[in-house]
Amino acid sequence: LPAQVAFTPYAPEPGSTCRLREYYDQTAQMCCSKCSPGQHAKVFCTKTSDTVCDSCEDSTYTQLWNWVPECLSCGSRCSSDQVETQACTREQNRICTCRPGWYCALSKQEGCRLCAPLRKCRPGFGVARPGTETSDVVCKPCAPGTFSNTTSSTDICRPHQICNVVAIPGNASMDAVCTSTSPTRSMAPGAVHLPQPVSTRSQHTQPTPEPSTAPSTSFLLPMGPSPPAEGSTGD
């Protein structure tokens, strides 16, 4: 004959433990039912009555089988630099993640506790390592022959254009400006000479770096935040 199935509450056999989704109540000295996710123990079991479970109240939850007297509190509302990727329900906590242009500076088990704006590389610096959900942008100074003229968290250093004749040499924060050696038509006095790039950017003439924008000293990566560009904001 099969062993009789015990219904909760029941006293465990000496040396045995309670079954799955049951717990041992120290006061009743009985195996009793746990409460399912979305519920909590409203009344703990006795020798004659099983656990009475009740639904979690608003703004509280239980994600796991439990025998807790109160549900866990959902985290506070997402801040302005976050988006709610999972709402607070009776069975799950609210999850807040960082909005685009921000990264998680202080994470928690799920979601993010503290978001920070992605660093923007100022002119003369380009992105060495892009930002991720959990790491900031790393900037590097543009190497000779490359430049970045933007304040950006995504732009990398780009090669200077190659000129037959250089009107203005490029530097770390500005592209080279080319001039035409034999203009096909005469220009009106004061006309703007448009750049005349040579077919590819694969080679470059060595520009003369300006010390203020392309320092010759070497930098160790990752760099700390580069000073913000004039008029730049954190967003």
């Epitope: 045995s16 433990t17 309670c18 079954r19 041992y24 120290q26 906590n93 088990q109």
Partner: antibody
């Protein structure tokens, strides 16, 4: 129902020591929540580690105690032990074992509160 | 983690007087998880109150526990010489990644 600790001793810094908590009048091996608490001379109570001796068998450690302290149960001896390694003078204390009167559980995590009974304690002195 | 902060660290009162000990949790906790203990010099701690306000067996009604959230109080009225001891609160809470449990730093009660 009573508890008694043993194994306290005078040891050198860097040594290891195992403390034992023996229960009388109840079984620590099934469905008990047993904890070790220490008290340095003239100081307050500090919770070290707990073990749920029921089906979950889950353990809990104070954040400062992880790594050097290990709590376990001995099924046939009706005891709970605390293994301590790399002892320093800061570990000099009276070590108590206690049983939680109430337990509450969330998933695999168990909280034990209302410690009763307590053992009389065993003194561990770490000195060269 | 959780930090349980007790105030005052020490208090002196006369026989027959009343003493109030506060215990503040660094995080809101269920009153179910709050206990109080009494410890006399050279002795093991003794459970006084559990679930914030329920008296343990044999504890006189002069001891009263109250509070909720982050603020809990132990009140001892009609002080007796035998009440001279250090009192500790204990509390904790659950989160999705664990369970936290700690004692307060203790409050010494001196009876004049």
């Amino acid at each position: 129902q009573s508890l008694e600790e043993s194994g306290g001793d005078l040891v050198q810094p860097g040594a290891s020591l195992t403390l034992t908590c023996t229960a009388s009048g109840f079984s620590v091996n099934v469905n008990s929540y047993m904890c070790w608490v220490r008290q340095a001379p003239g100081k307050g109570l500090e919770l070290i580690a707990c073990i749920d001796t029921g089906s979950g068998g889950s353990t809990w450690y104070g954040s400062w105690a992880k790594g050097r302290f290990t709590i376990s149960k001995s099924t046939n001896l009706n005891t709970v032990t605390l293994q301590m390694t790399s002892l320093t003078a800061a570990d000099t204390a009276t070590y108590f074992c206690a049983r939680a009167r109430n337990t509450y559980g969330y998933g695999d995590y168990v909280y034990g509160g209302a410690f009763d009974p307590w053992g009389p304690g065993t003194l561990v002195t770490v000195s060269s | 983690d959780i930090v349980m902060t007790q105030t005052p660290a020490s208090v002196e009162a006369a026989v027959g007087g009343t003493v109030t000990i506060k215990c503040q949790a660094s995080q809101s906790i269920s009153s179910t998880y709050l206990s109080w203990y009494q410890q006399k010099p050279g002795q093991r701690p003794k459970l006084l109150i559990y679930q914030a306000s329920t008296l343990a067996s044999g504890v006189p009604s002069r001891f009263k526990g109250s509070g909720s959230g982050t603020e809990f109080t132990l009140t001892i009225s009609d002080l007796e010489c035998a009440d001279a001891a250090t009192y500790y609160c204990q509390g904790g809470y659950f989160s999705d990644n664990g369970c936290y449990n700690a004692f307060g730093g203790g409050t010494e009660v001196v009876v004049k």
